[in-house]
């Protein structure tokens, strides 16, 4: 059965998924998809990484953590009730039927009538969105755009401002984690 995670309409949802790279920079392809994990890859892919970088993503979906260290947890921006459902995190470890797959259930609750004001920085304003693409075929050139002039440490620091550190630790403890190597 799927592990369940909750968020309110209008909030950002966080779905944890981690692995430990065998060596620094020795990354494993990962995909995130809406729907339970199928036999291969992910269905309805919302984000992919390869051995080097995020190579496909759609608007509202991103990796806040340091994916180069194996934190491939998915953030979904400004969720609506339609974002409810099962999500697949698939870690594509090379070998014979080595893939690790995790199904995570996201439950979206209606927003409270009078939400308390927050003092979080606007992540979108502080770190402008990368150019998103919607691919329709492998032959189509994917223009992924480039990162703003900001280093990974800054990104991690900025991302951490979006999450209460204790909550993030709780989610990390309860999230999907595997060790490679």
């Amino acid at each position: 059965s799927e592990v369940e995670y909750r968020a309110e309409v209008g909030q950002n949802a966080y779905l944890p998924c981690f692995y430990t790279p065998a060596a620094p920079g020795n990354l494993v392809p990962v995909c995130w998809g809406k729907g339970a994990c199928p036999v291969f890859e992910c269905g309805n892919v919302v984000l992919r990484t390869d051995e080097r970088d995020v190579n496909y993503w759609t608007s509202r979906y991103w990796l806040n953590g340091d994916f180069r260290k194996g934190d491939v947890s998915l953030t979904i921006e400004n969720v609506t009730l339609a974002d409810s459902g099962i999500y697949c995190c698939r870690i594509q470890i090379p070998g014979i039927m080595n893939d690790e797959k995790f199904n995570l259930k996201l439950v979206i609750k209606p927003a409270k009538v009078t939400p308390a004001p927050t003092r979080q920085r606007d992540f979108t304003a502080a770190f402008p969105r990368m150019l998103t693409t919607r691919g329709h075929g492998p032959a189509e050139t994917q223009t992924l755009g480039s990162l703003p002039d900001i280093n990974l440490t800054q990104i991690s620091t900025l991302a951490n401002e979006l999450r209460d550190s204790r909550l993030a630790n709780d989610l990390r403890d309860s999230g999907a984690t595997i060790r490679i190597g």
Partner: antibody
Framework: EVQLVESGGGLVKPGGSLRLSCAAS????????MTWVRQAPGKGLEWVAS????????YYLDSLKSRFTISRDNAKNILYLQMNSLRAEDTAVYYC????????????????WGQGTLVTVSS | DIQMTQSPSSLSASVGDRVTITCRAS??????LTWYQQKPGKSPKLLVY???TLAEGVPSRFSGSGSGTQFTLTISSLQPEDFATYYC?????????FGQGTKLEIK
């Protein structure tokens, strides 16, 4: 035009080996998962093995993975199936198939198939 | 393994008939179901994927429906070229498995 052409089938004695090939053309081979499916005479379809784009990930029918090996050569656009310790029950037409794929989907169904190559295992 | 059971195993019908073929999975496979058509001596042809999405070039008289464990392939008005064997295939669990096939014959 997408084309998949299998070769390498034939008559082999029980315990023997064969290597099937599937030559691909008309598409960017290295963008696609590839699969072998077999069909015994007068019977239904049975999945045999699949391989991801770069050959680093392979998937097998459990009962075959000790005897069969799927591989690919992206430079030559060829898919292979090495079959060892063949048995009479391996007699079938072997099809190679392309995993339907686009960036927002997954290659779990097969949009193009070869014409098949017949493998007969008999003494 | 997930077992896929098709019914009927064979079916006789006439040109113009509406025909429905059923595929049942032994466990929940969500919408991870594909339908293929195969004619004698030929390789299979993709008809429907993800339970209800028509593959490119497939006539609109074909339609797929269902989710979970029960799925159907419907041909709204049979044409002479539709007489063939139809297979369902699940792609939720390893190994990929096919139904045993439904042979559609001319009455």
């Amino acid at each position: 035009e997408v084309q998949l052409v299998e070769s390498g089938g034939g008559l082999v004695k029980p315990g023997g080996s064969l290597r099937l090939s599937c030559a691909a053309s008309g598409f960017t081979f290295s963008d696609y998962y590839m699969t072998w499916v077999r069909q015994a005479p007068g019977k239904g379809l049975e999945w045999v093995a699949s391989i991801n784009y770069d050959g680093r990930n392979t998937y097998y029918l459990d009962s075959l993975k000790s005897r069969f090996t799927i591989s690919r050569d992206n430079a030559k656009n060829i898919l292979y199936l090495q079959m060892n310790s063949l048995r009479a029950e391996d007699t079938a037409v072997y099809y190679c198939a392309r995993g339907y794929y686009y960036y927002g989907s997954s290659p779990n169904y097969f949009d193009y198939w070869g014409q098949g190559t017949l493998v007969t295992v008999s003494s | 393994d997930i077992q896929m059971t098709q019914s009927p195993s064979s079916l006789s019908a006439s040109v113009g008939d509406r025909v429905t073929i059923t595929c049942r999975a032994s466990e929940n496979i969500y919408s991870y179901l594909t339908w293929y058509q195969q004619k004698p001596g030929k390789s299979p042809k993709l008809l429907v994927y993800n339970a209800k999405t028509l593959a490119e070039g497939v006539p609109s008289r074909f339609s797929g429906s269902g989710s979970g464990t029960q799925f159907t392939l419907t041909i709204s008005s049979l044409q002479p070229e539709d007489f063939a064997t139809y297979y369902c295939q699940q792609h939720y669990g390893t190994p990929l498995t096919f139904g045993q096939g439904t042979k559609l014959e001319i009455k």
